[in-house]
Amino acid sequence: APVPPGEDSKDVAAPHRQPLTSSERIDKQIRYILDGISALRKETCNKSNMCESSKEALAENNLNLPKMAEKDGCFQSGFNEETCLVKIITGLLEFEVYLEYLQNRFESSEEQARAVQMSTKVLIQFLQKKAKNLDAITTPDPTTNASLLTKLQAQNQWLQDMTTHLILRSFKEFLQSSLRALRQM
Protein backbone atom coordinates (compact mmCIF):
# COMPACT_ATOMS: atom_id res chain seq x y z
CA ALA A 1 0.00 0.00 0.00
CA PRO A 2 1.24 3.54 -0.65
CA VAL A 3 2.56 5.67 2.16
CA PRO A 4 -0.30 7.64 3.78
CA PRO A 5 -0.41 11.41 3.19
CA GLY A 6 2.04 13.41 5.23
CA GLU A 7 4.51 10.53 5.33
CA ASP A 8 6.10 10.72 1.92
CA SER A 9 9.82 11.16 1.37
CA LYS A 10 9.46 14.90 0.75
CA ASP A 11 7.94 15.43 4.19
CA VAL A 12 10.70 13.39 5.84
CA ALA A 13 13.35 15.38 4.01
CA ALA A 14 11.83 18.69 5.10
CA PRO A 15 11.12 18.47 8.85
CA HIS A 16 11.00 22.25 9.24
CA ARG A 17 8.31 22.78 6.64
CA GLN A 18 5.12 24.56 7.65
CA PRO A 19 2.40 22.14 8.84
CA LEU A 20 -0.22 21.45 6.18
CA THR A 21 -3.29 23.67 6.14
CA SER A 22 -6.72 22.04 6.22
CA SER A 23 -7.10 22.57 2.44
CA GLU A 24 -3.67 21.10 1.68
CA ARG A 25 -4.41 18.11 3.88
CA ILE A 26 -7.71 17.48 2.06
CA ASP A 27 -5.99 17.86 -1.33
CA LYS A 28 -3.26 15.43 -0.35
CA GLN A 29 -5.78 12.97 1.03
CA ILE A 30 -7.75 12.94 -2.24
CA ARG A 31 -4.59 12.45 -4.29
CA TYR A 32 -3.56 9.59 -2.01
CA ILE A 33 -6.93 7.90 -2.58
CA LEU A 34 -6.63 8.50 -6.35
CA ASP A 35 -3.23 6.78 -6.36
CA GLY A 36 -4.82 3.84 -4.54
CA ILE A 37 -7.63 3.68 -7.09
CA SER A 38 -5.06 3.66 -9.93
CA ALA A 39 -3.39 0.61 -8.39
CA LEU A 40 -6.74 -1.17 -8.02
CA ARG A 41 -7.72 -0.31 -11.59
CA LYS A 42 -4.45 -1.82 -12.80
CA GLU A 43 -5.31 -5.14 -11.18
CA THR A 44 -8.88 -5.04 -12.51
CA CYS A 45 -7.80 -4.21 -16.05
CA ASN A 46 -5.05 -6.84 -16.07
CA LYS A 47 -7.39 -9.52 -14.76
CA SER A 48 -10.23 -8.99 -17.22
CA ASN A 49 -11.07 -7.04 -20.36
CA MET A 50 -13.63 -4.90 -18.51
CA CYS A 51 -11.69 -1.69 -19.09
CA GLU A 52 -12.21 -2.03 -22.85
CA SER A 53 -15.75 -3.42 -22.68
CA SER A 54 -18.55 -1.67 -24.50
CA LYS A 55 -21.18 -3.41 -22.38
CA GLU A 56 -20.83 -1.04 -19.42
CA ALA A 57 -24.42 0.19 -19.78
CA LEU A 58 -25.76 -3.26 -18.87
CA ALA A 59 -24.11 -3.15 -15.46
CA GLU A 60 -24.55 0.57 -14.94
CA ASN A 61 -28.32 0.07 -14.79
CA ASN A 62 -27.91 -1.83 -11.51
CA LEU A 63 -25.85 0.91 -9.94
CA ASN A 64 -26.69 4.34 -8.67
CA LEU A 65 -23.19 5.73 -8.40
CA PRO A 66 -22.85 9.37 -7.33
CA LYS A 67 -22.09 11.73 -10.20
CA MET A 68 -21.22 15.40 -10.33
CA ALA A 69 -23.56 17.57 -12.39
CA GLU A 70 -23.80 21.29 -13.19
CA LYS A 71 -26.58 21.79 -10.62
CA ASP A 72 -24.26 20.63 -7.81
CA GLY A 73 -22.35 23.92 -7.93
CA CYS A 74 -18.94 22.28 -8.26
CA PHE A 75 -18.09 23.40 -11.80
CA GLN A 76 -16.56 26.76 -12.66
CA SER A 77 -19.84 27.91 -14.20
CA GLY A 78 -22.32 28.35 -11.38
CA PHE A 79 -19.79 27.52 -8.68
CA ASN A 80 -21.35 27.53 -5.20
CA GLU A 81 -19.05 26.60 -2.33
CA GLU A 82 -21.69 25.46 0.16
CA THR A 83 -23.83 23.49 -2.31
CA CYS A 84 -20.72 21.88 -3.75
CA LEU A 85 -19.29 20.88 -0.37
CA VAL A 86 -22.61 19.27 0.56
CA LYS A 87 -22.57 17.36 -2.75
CA ILE A 88 -19.01 16.13 -2.21
CA ILE A 89 -19.68 14.89 1.33
CA THR A 90 -23.05 13.33 0.38
CA GLY A 91 -21.44 11.65 -2.63
CA LEU A 92 -18.58 10.23 -0.57
CA LEU A 93 -21.03 8.88 2.00
CA GLU A 94 -22.97 7.22 -0.82
CA PHE A 95 -19.78 5.69 -2.21
CA GLU A 96 -19.00 3.99 1.11
CA VAL A 97 -21.29 1.01 0.44
CA TYR A 98 -19.59 0.48 -2.94
CA LEU A 99 -16.15 0.68 -1.32
CA GLU A 100 -17.32 -1.99 1.12
CA TYR A 101 -18.30 -4.13 -1.86
CA LEU A 102 -14.76 -3.79 -3.25
CA GLN A 103 -13.20 -5.27 -0.13
CA ASN A 104 -13.34 -8.90 -1.27
CA ARG A 105 -12.79 -8.22 -4.93
CA PHE A 106 -8.99 -8.08 -5.01
CA GLU A 107 -6.35 -10.75 -4.61
CA SER A 108 -2.96 -9.04 -4.79
CA SER A 109 -4.30 -5.58 -3.82
CA GLU A 110 -6.39 -6.46 -0.78
CA GLU A 111 -4.46 -4.03 1.44
CA GLN A 112 -4.81 -1.31 -1.17
CA ALA A 113 -8.60 -1.73 -1.27
CA ARG A 114 -8.71 -1.43 2.52
CA ALA A 115 -6.48 1.67 2.38
CA VAL A 116 -8.83 3.35 -0.13
CA GLN A 117 -11.82 2.59 2.09
CA MET A 118 -10.19 3.85 5.32
CA SER A 119 -8.69 6.93 3.64
CA THR A 120 -12.14 7.84 2.31
CA LYS A 121 -13.54 7.73 5.86
CA VAL A 122 -10.76 10.09 6.96
CA LEU A 123 -11.47 12.39 3.98
CA ILE A 124 -15.16 12.56 4.94
CA GLN A 125 -14.15 13.61 8.47
CA PHE A 126 -11.84 16.33 7.10
CA LEU A 127 -14.63 17.65 4.88
CA GLN A 128 -17.28 17.55 7.61
CA LYS A 129 -15.04 19.82 9.70
CA LYS A 130 -14.93 22.21 6.76
CA ALA A 131 -18.70 22.17 6.14
CA LYS A 132 -20.94 24.67 7.93
CA ASN A 133 -24.28 23.41 6.66
CA LEU A 134 -24.14 19.85 8.00
CA ASP A 135 -27.96 19.68 8.19
CA ALA A 136 -28.16 19.52 4.40
CA ILE A 137 -26.04 16.36 4.32
CA THR A 138 -28.15 13.22 4.06
CA THR A 139 -26.62 9.99 5.33
CA PRO A 140 -27.52 6.85 3.39
CA ASP A 141 -29.94 4.45 5.10
CA PRO A 142 -27.98 1.44 6.56
CA THR A 143 -30.79 -1.02 5.73
CA THR A 144 -30.89 0.11 2.10
CA ASN A 145 -27.09 -0.17 1.94
CA ALA A 146 -27.14 -3.69 3.39
CA SER A 147 -29.65 -4.93 0.83
CA LEU A 148 -27.74 -3.23 -2.00
CA LEU A 149 -24.54 -4.96 -0.87
CA THR A 150 -26.31 -8.34 -0.81
CA LYS A 151 -27.71 -7.71 -4.28
CA LEU A 152 -24.31 -6.75 -5.71
CA GLN A 153 -22.61 -9.78 -4.18
CA ALA A 154 -25.27 -12.09 -5.65
CA GLN A 155 -24.48 -11.03 -9.24
CA ASN A 156 -22.80 -13.42 -11.65
CA GLN A 157 -19.01 -13.25 -12.10
CA TRP A 158 -19.09 -11.10 -15.24
CA LEU A 159 -21.39 -8.52 -13.64
CA GLN A 160 -19.28 -8.49 -10.46
CA ASP A 161 -16.15 -7.76 -12.52
CA MET A 162 -17.98 -5.05 -14.45
CA THR A 163 -19.38 -3.55 -11.23
CA THR A 164 -15.86 -3.41 -9.73
CA HIS A 165 -14.57 -1.62 -12.83
CA LEU A 166 -17.48 0.86 -12.85
CA ILE A 167 -17.16 1.65 -9.13
CA LEU A 168 -13.45 2.38 -9.48
CA ARG A 169 -13.95 4.48 -12.59
CA SER A 170 -16.84 6.48 -11.13
CA PHE A 171 -15.10 7.00 -7.79
CA LYS A 172 -11.98 8.23 -9.57
CA GLU A 173 -14.04 10.67 -11.65
CA PHE A 174 -15.99 11.91 -8.63
CA LEU A 175 -12.78 12.51 -6.67
CA GLN A 176 -11.12 14.32 -9.56
CA SER A 177 -14.06 16.70 -9.87
CA SER A 178 -14.05 17.16 -6.09
CA LEU A 179 -10.33 17.90 -6.12
CA ARG A 180 -10.78 20.58 -8.73
CA ALA A 181 -13.78 22.11 -6.95
CA LEU A 182 -12.09 22.14 -3.54
CA ARG A 183 -9.14 24.02 -5.02
CA GLN A 184 -11.53 26.89 -5.75
CA MET A 185 -12.71 27.12 -2.14
Epitope: D27, K172, Q176, S177, L179, Q184
Partner: antibody
Framework: EVQLVQSGGGLIQPGGSLRLSCAAS????????MIWVRQAPGKGLEWVSD????????YYADSVKGRFTMSRDISKNTVYLQMNSLRAEDTGVYYC?????????????WGRGTLVTVSS | DIVMTQSPSTLSASVGDRVTITCRAS??????LAWYQQKPGRAPKVLIY???TLESGVPSRFSGSGSGTDFTLTISSLQPEDFATYYC????????FGQGTKLEIK
Amino acid sequence: EVQLVQSGGGLIQPGGSLRLSCAASGFTISSNYMIWVRQAPGKGLEWVSDLYYYAGDTYYADSVKGRFTMSRDISKNTVYLQMNSLRAEDTGVYYCARWADDHPRYIDHWGRGTLVTVSS
Amino acid sequence: DIVMTQSPSTLSASVGDRVTITCRASQGISSWLAWYQQKPGRAPKVLIYKASTLESGVPSRFSGSGSGTDFTLTISSLQPEDFATYYCQQSWLGGSFGQGTKLEIK
Protein backbone atom coordinates in the same frame (compact mmCIF):
# COMPACT_ATOMS: atom_id res chain seq x y z
CA GLU B 1 0.47 7.27 -32.18
CA VAL B 2 -1.12 10.32 -30.54
CA GLN B 3 -2.07 13.05 -33.02
CA LEU B 4 -4.01 16.30 -32.73
CA VAL B 5 -5.11 17.74 -36.08
CA GLN B 6 -6.32 21.33 -35.91
CA SER B 7 -8.50 23.34 -38.28
CA GLY B 8 -10.72 26.41 -38.38
CA GLY B 9 -8.34 29.34 -38.10
CA GLY B 10 -8.37 32.39 -40.36
CA LEU B 11 -8.95 36.11 -40.65
CA ILE B 12 -11.97 37.50 -38.85
CA GLN B 13 -13.29 40.98 -38.11
CA PRO B 14 -13.53 42.30 -34.55
CA GLY B 15 -16.81 41.23 -32.97
CA GLY B 16 -16.99 38.18 -35.21
CA SER B 17 -17.08 34.46 -34.35
CA LEU B 18 -14.93 31.51 -35.25
CA ARG B 19 -14.88 27.84 -34.31
CA LEU B 20 -11.63 25.92 -33.99
CA SER B 21 -11.61 22.12 -34.22
CA CYS B 22 -9.11 19.62 -32.92
CA ALA B 23 -9.49 16.01 -34.08
CA ALA B 24 -7.68 13.53 -31.85
CA SER B 25 -6.37 10.13 -32.83
CA GLY B 26 -4.37 7.52 -30.93
CA PHE B 27 -6.36 8.11 -27.73
CA THR B 28 -9.93 8.88 -26.67
CA ILE B 29 -10.87 12.38 -25.55
CA SER B 30 -13.61 10.89 -23.34
CA SER B 31 -10.94 9.77 -20.87
CA ASN B 32 -8.39 12.56 -21.21
CA TYR B 33 -8.15 16.19 -20.18
CA MET B 34 -7.84 18.59 -23.10
CA ILE B 35 -6.58 22.16 -23.18
CA TRP B 36 -6.36 25.16 -25.52
CA VAL B 37 -3.32 27.44 -25.32
CA ARG B 38 -2.67 30.50 -27.47
CA GLN B 39 0.34 32.58 -28.38
CA ALA B 40 0.10 36.13 -29.70
CA PRO B 41 2.73 37.02 -32.36
CA GLY B 42 6.12 37.40 -30.67
CA LYS B 43 4.56 36.92 -27.23
CA GLY B 44 4.36 34.18 -24.58
CA LEU B 45 2.04 31.22 -24.08
CA GLU B 46 -1.38 31.89 -22.60
CA TRP B 47 -3.70 29.22 -21.21
CA VAL B 48 -7.18 29.73 -22.68
CA SER B 49 -9.36 26.90 -21.39
CA ASP B 50 -9.40 23.26 -20.46
CA LEU B 51 -11.96 20.51 -20.40
CA TYR B 52 -11.94 17.83 -17.74
CA TYR B 53 -13.23 14.69 -19.40
CA TYR B 54 -15.46 13.89 -16.44
CA ALA B 55 -18.87 15.49 -17.04
CA GLY B 56 -17.27 17.76 -19.65
CA ASP B 57 -16.42 20.30 -16.93
CA THR B 58 -14.73 23.33 -18.54
CA TYR B 59 -12.53 26.07 -17.10
CA TYR B 60 -11.63 29.37 -18.75
CA ALA B 61 -9.04 32.08 -18.33
CA ASP B 62 -10.52 35.40 -17.15
CA SER B 63 -9.53 37.00 -20.47
CA VAL B 64 -11.93 34.77 -22.46
CA LYS B 65 -14.62 33.89 -19.90
CA GLY B 66 -18.10 34.51 -21.29
CA ARG B 67 -16.84 34.81 -24.88
CA PHE B 68 -15.21 31.43 -25.57
CA THR B 69 -16.74 27.98 -25.15
CA MET B 70 -14.80 24.76 -25.18
CA SER B 71 -16.77 21.63 -26.04
CA ARG B 72 -16.33 18.13 -27.39
CA ASP B 73 -17.97 15.55 -29.59
CA ILE B 74 -17.04 12.14 -28.21
CA SER B 75 -18.40 10.30 -31.28
CA LYS B 76 -16.00 12.30 -33.50
CA ASN B 77 -13.19 12.29 -30.89
CA THR B 78 -12.94 16.04 -31.46
CA VAL B 79 -12.73 19.09 -29.21
CA TYR B 80 -13.83 22.57 -30.23
CA LEU B 81 -13.21 26.15 -29.22
CA GLN B 82 -16.11 28.43 -30.12
CA MET B 83 -14.84 32.02 -30.06
CA ASN B 84 -17.38 34.85 -30.02
CA SER B 85 -17.04 38.65 -29.72
CA LEU B 86 -13.49 38.41 -30.98
CA ARG B 87 -11.06 41.25 -30.25
CA ALA B 88 -7.74 42.29 -31.79
CA GLU B 89 -5.96 40.94 -28.69
CA ASP B 90 -7.30 37.44 -29.45
CA THR B 91 -4.98 37.29 -32.47
CA GLY B 92 -2.41 34.50 -32.31
CA VAL B 93 -1.63 30.85 -32.85
CA TYR B 94 -4.07 28.59 -31.00
CA TYR B 95 -2.76 25.21 -29.87
CA CYS B 96 -4.97 22.30 -28.95
CA ALA B 97 -3.20 20.00 -26.50
CA ARG B 98 -3.65 17.13 -24.09
CA TRP B 99 -2.95 17.22 -20.39
CA ALA B 100 -0.92 14.22 -19.28
CA ASP B 101 -1.85 12.05 -16.35
CA ASP B 102 -4.77 11.59 -14.00
CA HIS B 103 -4.37 14.80 -12.08
CA PRO B 104 -3.03 16.99 -14.90
CA ARG B 105 0.67 17.52 -14.47
CA TYR B 106 1.88 18.83 -17.80
CA ILE B 107 1.01 18.95 -21.50
CA ASP B 108 2.36 15.86 -23.24
CA HIS B 109 0.98 16.33 -26.77
CA TRP B 110 0.37 19.48 -28.79
CA GLY B 111 -1.37 20.18 -32.07
CA ARG B 112 0.55 22.10 -34.73
CA GLY B 113 -1.40 25.26 -33.99
CA THR B 114 -3.80 27.28 -36.09
CA LEU B 115 -3.49 31.02 -36.72
CA VAL B 116 -6.40 33.30 -35.81
CA THR B 117 -6.15 36.90 -36.99
CA VAL B 118 -8.69 39.43 -35.71
CA SER B 119 -8.47 42.56 -37.81
CA SER B 120 -10.69 44.95 -39.73
CA ASP C 1 -6.75 33.11 -12.34
CA ILE C 2 -3.50 32.06 -10.71
CA VAL C 3 -0.81 34.47 -11.90
CA MET C 4 2.64 33.07 -12.65
CA THR C 5 5.50 35.57 -12.56
CA GLN C 6 8.69 34.47 -14.26
CA SER C 7 12.08 36.13 -14.09
CA PRO C 8 14.22 37.27 -15.72
CA SER C 9 12.41 37.95 -18.99
CA THR C 10 15.70 37.77 -20.92
CA LEU C 11 18.90 36.04 -19.94
CA SER C 12 22.23 36.29 -21.78
CA ALA C 13 24.65 33.46 -21.14
CA SER C 14 27.45 31.46 -22.73
CA VAL C 15 27.89 27.77 -23.48
CA GLY C 16 29.00 26.00 -20.30
CA ASP C 17 27.32 28.53 -17.96
CA ARG C 18 25.01 27.53 -15.14
CA VAL C 19 21.71 29.40 -15.38
CA THR C 20 18.68 29.68 -13.13
CA ILE C 21 15.18 30.85 -14.02
CA THR C 22 12.61 31.49 -11.30
CA CYS C 23 8.84 31.33 -11.27
CA ARG C 24 6.49 32.59 -8.56
CA ALA C 25 2.80 31.71 -8.21
CA SER C 26 0.24 34.20 -6.86
CA GLN C 27 -1.07 31.45 -4.53
CA GLY C 28 0.17 28.09 -3.29
CA ILE C 29 0.18 25.44 -6.01
CA SER C 30 1.91 22.65 -4.07
CA SER C 31 4.22 20.97 -6.63
CA TRP C 32 1.87 21.34 -9.61
CA LEU C 33 4.36 23.09 -11.85
CA ALA C 34 5.91 22.18 -15.21
CA TRP C 35 8.72 23.76 -17.22
CA TYR C 36 8.69 23.90 -21.03
CA GLN C 37 11.21 24.82 -23.70
CA GLN C 38 10.03 26.45 -26.91
CA LYS C 39 11.99 27.14 -30.07
CA PRO C 40 10.76 29.56 -32.78
CA GLY C 41 7.93 28.20 -34.91
CA ARG C 42 7.60 25.05 -32.78
CA ALA C 43 5.19 23.84 -30.12
CA PRO C 44 6.64 23.79 -26.59
CA LYS C 45 8.28 20.68 -25.18
CA VAL C 46 8.04 19.62 -21.53
CA LEU C 47 11.30 19.40 -19.56
CA ILE C 48 10.20 19.07 -15.94
CA TYR C 49 6.85 18.29 -14.31
CA LYS C 50 5.64 18.03 -10.70
CA ALA C 51 8.22 20.80 -9.99
CA SER C 52 11.23 18.47 -10.00
CA THR C 53 10.53 15.34 -12.09
CA LEU C 54 12.62 15.17 -15.25
CA GLU C 55 10.65 14.11 -18.32
CA SER C 56 12.13 11.01 -19.94
CA GLY C 57 14.59 11.82 -22.70
CA VAL C 58 15.40 15.25 -21.27
CA PRO C 59 19.13 15.72 -20.48
CA SER C 60 20.07 15.58 -16.79
CA ARG C 61 21.62 19.06 -16.95
CA PHE C 62 18.04 20.34 -16.52
CA SER C 63 16.66 20.29 -12.99
CA GLY C 64 13.72 21.84 -11.17
CA SER C 65 12.99 22.59 -7.55
CA GLY C 66 10.48 24.38 -5.35
CA SER C 67 7.08 23.93 -3.79
CA GLY C 68 4.19 26.18 -2.77
CA THR C 69 4.78 29.50 -4.52
CA ASP C 70 8.48 29.62 -5.47
CA PHE C 71 10.11 27.47 -8.13
CA THR C 72 13.36 27.36 -10.09
CA LEU C 73 14.63 25.78 -13.28
CA THR C 74 18.39 25.25 -13.45
CA ILE C 75 20.53 24.32 -16.44
CA SER C 76 23.85 23.18 -14.99
CA SER C 77 25.99 23.58 -18.09
CA LEU C 78 24.48 25.34 -21.10
CA GLN C 79 24.70 23.60 -24.46
CA PRO C 80 24.23 25.36 -27.85
CA GLU C 81 20.81 23.69 -28.32
CA ASP C 82 19.53 25.14 -25.01
CA PHE C 83 19.17 28.68 -26.37
CA ALA C 84 15.38 29.02 -26.51
CA THR C 85 12.46 30.44 -24.55
CA TYR C 86 11.43 28.76 -21.28
CA TYR C 87 8.01 28.83 -19.64
CA CYS C 88 6.64 27.63 -16.32
CA GLN C 89 3.02 26.46 -16.09
CA GLN C 90 0.88 25.65 -13.07
CA SER C 91 -1.69 22.86 -13.19
CA TRP C 92 -3.21 23.40 -9.74
CA LEU C 93 -6.28 25.08 -11.20
CA GLY C 94 -6.52 25.89 -14.87
CA GLY C 95 -3.13 26.05 -16.55
CA SER C 96 -1.68 29.57 -16.55
CA PHE C 97 1.87 30.15 -17.78
CA GLY C 98 4.65 32.47 -16.75
CA GLN C 99 5.46 35.18 -19.30
CA GLY C 100 8.57 33.34 -20.50
CA THR C 101 12.34 33.73 -20.27
CA LYS C 102 14.30 34.13 -23.48
CA LEU C 103 17.72 32.57 -23.10
CA GLU C 104 20.11 34.11 -25.61
CA ILE C 105 23.78 33.79 -26.48
CA LYS C 106 25.97 36.39 -24.77
